[in-house]
């Protein structure tokens, strides 16, 4: 039975040219996390963290994505095209797969606030 829940940073906004932390947290389960996938709104994979081998950043994002903090992901040099949904997928044993959603809005305005509250989707 899957007892866990994914908490995410929910809906966040950040300035064009700036950076943002995408963060998910799996709680309420003792399941072992074997892999975490980070996926963009167009279903392209940004990065994967394998529990044994570590981070793989997909070549297309190598210059703009930094691993961490933790199992999260830092997206840098933001453009307006980065606006959209991001998904974290936790592969766990024995529970199976948990998925969280984050919506990122990239703003032109210099007064854009970067909120980083945790929400349960």
């Amino acid at each position: 039975m899957m007892t866990g829940t994914i908490e995410t940073t929910g809906n966040i906004s950040a300035k064009k040219g700036g950076s943002v932390i995408l963060q998910c947290h799996l709680s309420s389960t003792m399941a072992q996390v074997t892999q975490v996938n980070w996926e963009q709104h167009d279903h392209s994979l940004l990065a994967i963290r394998n529990a044994e081998l570590g981070w793989h950043i997909y070549p297309a994002f190598k210059d703009r994505v930094a691993p961490g903090p933790g199992l999260g992901l830092t997206l840098q040099s933001l453009t307006m095209n980065d606006t959209g949904e991001y998904f974290c997928t936790y592969h766990t044993y024995p529970d199976g797969t948990y998925r969280g959603r984050i919506f990122l809005e990239v703003l032109e305005s210099s007064v854009a606030e970067h909120s980083a509250r945790f929400q349960i989707p």
């Epitope: 892999q35 996938n37 994979l45 994967i48 394998n50 044994e52 081998l53 570590g54 981070w55 793989h56 950043i57 997909y58 930094a66 691993p67």
Partner: antibody, heavy 128, light 108 residues
Framework: EVQLVESGGGLVQPGGSLRLSCAAS????????MDWVRQAPGKGLEWVGR??????????EYAASVKGRFTISRDDSKNSLYLQMNSLKTEDTAVYYC???????????????????WGQGTTVTVSS | EIVLTQSPGTLSLSPGERATLSCRAS???????LAWYQQKPGQAPRLLIY???SRATGIPDRFSGSGSGTDFTLTISRLEPEDFAVYYC?????????FGGGTKVEIK
Amino acid sequence: EVQLVESGGGLVQPGGSLRLSCAASGFTFSDHYMDWVRQAPGKGLEWVGRTRNKANSYTTEYAASVKGRFTISRDDSKNSLYLQMNSLKTEDTAVYYCARGQYYYGSSSRGYYYMDVWGQGTTVTVSS
Amino acid sequence: EIVLTQSPGTLSLSPGERATLSCRASQSVSSSYLAWYQQKPGQAPRLLIYGASSRATGIPDRFSGSGSGTDFTLTISRLEPEDFAVYYCQQAVPSPLTFGGGTKVEIK
């Protein structure tokens, strides 16, 4: 041309130390995991350890047989990999190879790890 | 750690014959982390197969790999004189990375 060249092998007494080097060329060294593998005379291959890439903060991992005695390090500015071997034992006698680790995922999030480029090896003999 | 057992230890065959090499894992391993290497005397190992079935760059199509779970196979469809060597399987996940003991393919 993608190439790995080991150096630093030699004869050392039990309890002694030795530092092996591996010079890499022809590829972006900082992007890659790097492994050390050894082969005792007339025996099979044995994995010694690895250093991960820059994205993984160059973290290291070791085989149980060498943990606490061997240290793997790298200098990306020199495209070089190192293996510091301390408290050497006669059973450490072997040819030591450095190898490039290919760690990646395909579009289907299927992961791979293998060693696709190997050096020619350097011989370490531990004997009194 | 996962123990890889290769069989047979030695395979005596003639050029032109088919070689079938086995690699058995002590517990299930992901096929994507299973590789095969060839080693000739006095030389470094050479990658043949990765992901259990994908040929490395420059490897002739007479070499093929298959298998999943605990049983993997390397097949050489028609042995060429340069194929007589020692072959090793290797797995990378779970850690630590381990090699099989090797199979020597020798001329009969």
